[in-house]
């Protein structure tokens, strides 16, 4: 699986999850998030050669088409597969609130 | 929606579904498919600027990050959203068989 366990331990050029730390205030302009100050959102990147973690029949077909037609511009792309939520603390005035934000952290990637 | 209705009628540079005809024999080397000879598989391509048909909170966050950090290499990618099956005819010996292959045709795209 193209997950953090594999991708963060290997120098993988092809589609894999990559570490990306986002600072809420500096990178997003979100002043309302109190904690954490930032988090590892991660992202997916890298080429999708034929049969690499293909998501659907279409991505397999497209990968094969690309292999047999190297000049073609159509190829699968490396995108998130599994995402996890992030728990944040914010304030409504002076009152603290805890919220779980869904689909915030990429844990694995696929070729789609 | 970034679907065939919209994308095939407009000269859209950003993420959209593009027409791609695949000939089973010539492009894939699939001699076993008798009918059709080929089909419009289509594919997704084009940049994913901030907020363009974002798939999840993560892709929106990544798009925002990319907007505020233009030098960043992390950005959402244009991939299939809705896929449709394709019905094919093939032969087992002299016996014709009809099969529905799932997820063969891209109908719309998203930024993921």
């Amino acid at each position: 699986a193209l997950d953090t366990n594999y991708c963060f331990r290997n120098l993988e050029e092809n589609c894999c999850v990559r570490p990306l730390y986002i600072d809420f205030r500096q990178d997003l302009g979100w002043k309302w998030v109190h904690e954490p100050k930032g988090y590892y959102a991660n992202f997916c990147s890298g080429p999708c050669p034929y049969l690499r973690s293909a998501d659907t029949t279409h991505s397999t077909v497209l990968g094969l088409y690309n292999t047999l037609n190297p000049e073609a511009s159509a190829s699968p792309c490396c995108v998130p597969q599994d995402l996890e939520p992030l728990t944040i603390l914010y304030y409504v005035g002076r009152t603290p609130k805890v919220e779980q934000l869904s689909n915030m952290v990429v844990k694995s990637c696929k070729c789609s | 929606a970034l679907d065939t209705n919209y994308c095939f009628r407009n000269l859209e540079e950003n993420c959209c579904v593009r027409p791609l005809y695949i000939d089973f024999r010539q492009d894939l080397g699939w001699k076993w498919v008798h009918e059709p000879k080929g089909y419009y598989a289509n594919f997704c391509s084009g940049p994913c600027p901030y907020l363009r048909s974002a798939d999840t909170t993560h892709s929106t966050v990544l798009g925002l990050y990319n907007t505020l950090n233009p030098e960043a290499s992390a950005s959402p990618c244009c991939v299939p959203q809705d896929l449709e099956p394709l019905t094919i005819l093939y032969y087992v010996g002299r016996t014709p068989k009809v099969e529905q292959l799932s997820n063969m045709v891209v109908k719309s795209c998203k930024c993921s």
Partner: antibody
Framework: QVQLVQSGAEVKKPGSSVKVSCKAS????????ISWVRQAPGQGLEWMGG????????NYAQRFKGRVTITADESTSTTYMELSSLRSEDTAVYYC?????????????WGQGTLVTVSS | ETVLTQSPGTLSLSPGERATLSCRAS???????LAWYQQKPGQAPRLLIY???SRAPGIPDRFSGSGSGTDFTLTISRLEPEDFAVYYC?????????FGQGTRLEIK
Amino acid sequence: QVQLVQSGAEVKKPGSSVKVSCKASGKTFSSNVISWVRQAPGQGLEWMGGVIPIVDIANYAQRFKGRVTITADESTSTTYMELSSLRSEDTAVYYCASTLGLVLDAMDYWGQGTLVTVSS
Amino acid sequence: ETVLTQSPGTLSLSPGERATLSCRASQSLGSSYLAWYQQKPGQAPRLLIYGASSRAPGIPDRFSGSGSGTDFTLTISRLEPEDFAVYYCQQYADSPITFGQGTRLEIK
């Protein structure tokens, strides 16, 4: 610099609903927190609630809970305020405003206002 | 909910004079949860002061805010003709956000 452009004036019957839109341009929409404030004719200002775009966290004044819904559509950089079960005392100018960044905060940029008249 | 009481209700002064507007909260707001706005007829409010004493961008330095706890003041050191308007204080320490009833500053 943020510009907030609101939808036009509305005349509504008692018991009906109204949905006012507020389109943002300028500073990135999803870095803003948007509040809604109303002002009855010749009266003061009254906060109704606010929303954090992207994550759609909304906070409402208790007196409007169950009657007001504030949502954000990131794809169009637009915030909506829907008020249901309208009565004559809901006749007011409705403003959207971007806060300085917190959920409850001072409001630095304001829309031009939308007059909602509730009359039978 | 926190009630804000502004005084006076109306203030009649001449250009060049000093204006002092008061805002009292029904409970302590700390030192940084109060804002002041100016509103002219037919216009949206305009933020003058936030955090009790910080001037918003583009606001002339004749406007100043002070105070903490329950008592806050907006001072306009030398009134200009364009300063005659209605002024509101706003608290954002607790939900719901509340506004004072306003002080009308009129030309004497």
